[in-house]
Each structure stands twice: as C-alpha cells, then as structure tokens.
Interface confidence: low
C-alpha cells in the first residue's frame, strides 16, 4: 500500500514511473533486437534487386518509431504506417503463399518454389520473423525484460498489431489464385481466430483474387482421410465464397513427398499422388 | 560504489588498445556502462553503452570502430585500430538507476589514450 | 541521427546573476534529456536528467525545464564555483544514433 500511497500523492499513472518496470507475462525484447532487424534490412536489400533502394537506417527509424516511448498496450496499426510505407512490396499474382499453424513448411515450400511467397519472405515478415519487441512508456528505452503477452496481457500490443498491420497488407495486394497452407494434424484445421482466419480472409479483395486454394497438409503418414471434407474447412468454404471468391481444397498426404516433388517434379514417384 | 579506468597509454596508430573499466559496490547484473570520451579541450563524446544482458549499442561513427565486452566486474571497451583521432580521455560511467539508461551519475577519473606515430 | 544543438558556446555572468543555456533535439527526445557540468581535469557530474529532475544533492538554483525539441537549463544567483562548461545529453538508448551530447556551453562567472 506504501506503493499506491506514492502513486495517489504524486498523481502519476504506474506506467510513468521508470523505476518501476512494467513486468508483463510474455518474454522480453529480442536480445540485440536493433542490431537484428537492422542486419536483416541489409541482407534482404542485398539479395532482393527490387528492394536496393531500400535505406535500412530509415526503416529502422520507422520500426523504432512505431513502439519507443509508447504504452505497450495502446499500440494501433497506424502507428506501423511509415513502416508499411518504406517496406511496400507487391508479389506477382498467384504467387501469394498464406499459411496458418504451419509455418516451418510453408517456409521450406517457398525456399524451394522461389517464385512463391510467404509474408516472411517479404522485407517487413523478413525483418519480424521470429522476433519479440516492446518499449515503455514515455522512455526510449526497449524493455528486454518482459513484453505484453496478447492472452494475459493485452492483445494491442508491439508485436501482434505489427503481425496484423503486414498480414492485413499482404492480403490487400494479393491477386489471381491465393494459396493457403493449413495444419490438418490440429483440431481446428482452419481457426476462425488465427491470423489467417481473422485477418487475412477478411482482406483478401474479390475484384482481384479469383480463387482460395487451400493445401491441407496431413500429418500422420497412414491418414488417407480427406481433410477438405473437415467441418471447419466448410466454414472456410462458406466465408470465402460470401465474399465472391472462389474456393479450391486440396489434401497433401505427404508433405515429405510434396516437398520433394517441388524439388524434383520429373521424379516418375511425383507421378502419382501426394 | 565507484568505478575507475585503467590501460590507457601511448599507442601507435593501428595497434588495437583495450580499456578496462573495473566497479566496485554494484553489480554488472544490475546496472549497464557507458563509454564517453572526450579529446583535448574538446567537448564529450558518446561511444557507447552495454545492457546488463551483455547487449552492445554504439554511436553510429564509433561501430566497428570500438567492441564493448563485459566480465563480472569489469567492462572493456577495445579500439580495434586507433587513429590520431582517438587521442582523447576516456571515462567509462554507470547510469542513475536501472539498466538501460545513458544518464551517467557515477563516473571515473578517466583514463588518457594518446595515439602518435 | 539525433543531433543536439546547444548555445551559447559561451556566457559571462557576474555573481549573483543568471545563466540560461539552450538545447535544440533535431527530433522529439520526449523527457529523456539530461544536464551535466564538467570543471577542468574532472568529470561530467549530472545535475539534471529526465529534462526537469534534480539529481541528488545538487542545489536547486539549477533549474531544467522543456520536453520534445526545445530544452533550458537555468542556474540562478550564480556563485564562483559554477564556472564549469555544461553540457546537455539525449538518452535515447536505441541503435544508431550519432553522438549524444552537445557541444558544451562554458559559463565564466565574473
């Protein structure tokens, strides 16, 4: 109560008083998260001709400033606007890769299938990827000791409002056929309160995406079931074509195979079903 | 509670030097070091700063050009290959309160690097 | 970069007068500023930070006040032993940013 005593007398929210750090329930900053994301700009801009003229300290500034110095719980998308801006990118038509609760495969898909791409194979998803931040109020300081968590914490903080600011973009400018890769080994094969499921869907525009086509991956190697059949890919079938886009599911029985079919699709094996 | 700089010494250009600054009465778990210096009847420079997690920030001119390192008790500051520019006393200082603050209230005597050929 | 910006180089005050110094931030630093004063062949020692703080035991004749671009430090009823240079500094502890001082402004207390 001696604590609250000093908070009446002086009227100063809790949050403004730096000797008191926030200890929120999620991990703490990215050690060298800085130095990560500025490293990262560098090597994406290396390697992606189109994003040369990218200046990496800029986008680091506008990353900065999306977070520093504010509450970690009142973060909005547009406090990632300039961000957006310096990290615009358009991916060809059917090209764009969606994934929900399958990340590592999709990742590997698109490591091998160079011409797709996944948000994380994008500058700003790039940056991100794997990645924890958050700042305190009124400091420049980034608290590498704990973050919000979005269950326990708050859901408007640093990190998700970034991951839903980019997810929304990337829906936005998606065009032609969208793929979608879906865990079919989880009991909610498409959740309706995934990233996927309450971002993307909902951005995908009709008058330029002419079709979803979702690639449920199945886990187990004897399971010949026929996922698209799931009551919650319906769902997904049903929210898509409410919105004029047309709906396409395709098992993948065995992801090992459909892997390695990319790699090799003359492989006489990649002839039969996967 | 003090802190205090040590190595500094004449040096000819391009032969890497490394400061020590040792603390006594607080702990590196608790609090970051900062590195200033400053050259001859010049004004104060930021070099750099460590986190008690062993994390490194730098002046934009001072990376590559110094590496900050940590021990239990003391933290380094190594400049990797010294010009005539980096003549200069370096003061190594630990912040008010927490961890990752630049405001020094706890400073060092310094310590005088001079680099001539 | 950030760059801090502080005039004058130099003020002559008789005692008993008063001293304003300047710091211009070339972008928003919030509060995160601080003031130290540094005597010849000693160290910076920290007067004021969190733009407006008083660090411990220093007198209350020194007086900072500002916050976003436009910081002041203010010392009153001069005395002999406030002849120093004085120098203001940004905190903002977050990768690559230039130096975080000013260039320093000497007070000559006549």
């Known amino acids: 109560s001696g604590l609250n005593d000093i908070f009446e007398a002086q009227k100063i929210e809790w949050h403004e008083l730096p000797r008191w750090r926030q200890q929120w329930s999620g991990s703490g900053t990215t050690s060298r998260f800085p130095e990560t994301v500025l490293a990262r700009c560098v090597k994406y801009t290396e390697v992606h001709p189109e994003m040369r003229h990218v200046d990496c300290q800029s986008v680091w500034d506008a990353f900065k400033g999306a977070f520093i110095s504010k509450y970690p719980c009142n973060i909005t998308e547009e406090d990632y606007q300039p961000l957006v801006k310096l990290g615009t990118q358009t991916v060809p038509c059917n090209k764009t890769l969606l994934w929900s609760r399958i990340k590592d495969l999709a990742h590997q898909f698109t490591q091998v299938q160079r011409d797709m791409f996944t948000l994380e194979d994008m500058l700003l998803g790039y940056l991100a990827d794997d990645l924890t931040w958050c700042g305190e109020f009124n400091t420049f300081e980034i608290n590498y000791q704990s973050c919000p968590d979005w269950r326990k914490d708050c859901s408007n903080n640093p990190v998700s409002v970034f991951w839903k600011t980019v997810s929304r973009r990337f829906a936005e400018t998606a065009c032609g056929v969208v793929h979608v890769m879906l865990n079919g080994s989880r009991s909610k094969i498409f959740d309706k309160n995934s990233t996927f499921g309450s971002v993307e869907v909902h951005n995908l525009q009709p008058e330029k995406v002419q079709a979803l086509e979702a690639w449920v991956i199945h886990g187990g190697r004897e399971d010949s079931r026929d996922l698209c059949q799931d009551p919650t890919i319906k769902e997904l079938e049903s929210i898509i074509s409410k919105r004029n886009i047309r709906f396409f599911c395709k098992n993948i029985y065995r992801p090992d195979k459909f892997l390695q079919c990319v790699k090799n699709p003359e492989d006489s094996s990649c002839l039969s079903g996967i | 509670q003090s802190v205090e700089e040590s190595g500094g010494r004449l040096v000819t250009p391009g032969t890497p030097l490394t400061l020590t600054c040792t603390v006594s009465?607080?702990?590196?778990?608790?609090?970051?070091v900062s590195w200033v210096r400053q050259a001859p009847g010049k004004g104060l420079e930021w070099i750099g700063y460590?986190?008690?997690?062993?994390g490194t920030y730098y002046a934009n001119w001072a990376q590559g050009r110094f590496t900050i390192s940590k021990t239990s008790t003391t933290v380094d500051l190594k400049i990797t290959s010294p010009t005539t520019e980096d003549t200069a006393t370096y003061f190594c200082?630990?912040?008010?309160?927490?961890?990752?603050?630049?405001?020094?209230?706890?400073w060092g005597p310094g310590t005088l690097v001079t680099v001539s050929s | 970069d950030v760059v801090m910006t502080q005039t004058p180089a130099s003020v002559s005050e008789p005692v008993g007068g008063t001293v304003t110094i300047n710091c211009q931030a070339s972008?928003?630093?919030?509060?995160?500023l601080a003031w130290y004063q540094q005597k010849p062949g000693q160290p910076p020692k920290l007067l004021i930070y969190?733009?407006?703080t008083l660090a411990s035991g220093v007198s209350s004749r020194f007086k900072g006040s500002g916050s976003g671009t436009e910081f002041t430090l203010t010392i009153s009823d001069l005395e002999s032993a406030d002849a120093a240079t004085y120098y203001c500094?940004?905190?903002?502890?977050?990768?690559?940013?230039?130096?975080?001082f000013g260039g320093g402004t000497e007070v000559v207390v006549k």
């Open positions: 972008e928003s630093i919030y509060s995160n």
């Open positions: 200082g630990r912040p008010k309160d927490s961890d990752s603050s630049a405001f020094v209230s706890l």
């Open positions: 969190k733009a407006s």
């Open positions: 500094q940004a905190n903002h502890m977050i990768v690559i940013y230039g130096n975080g």
């Open positions: 460590i986190l008690t997690s062993g």
């Open positions: 009465g607080f702990s590196l778990s608790n609090y970051g």
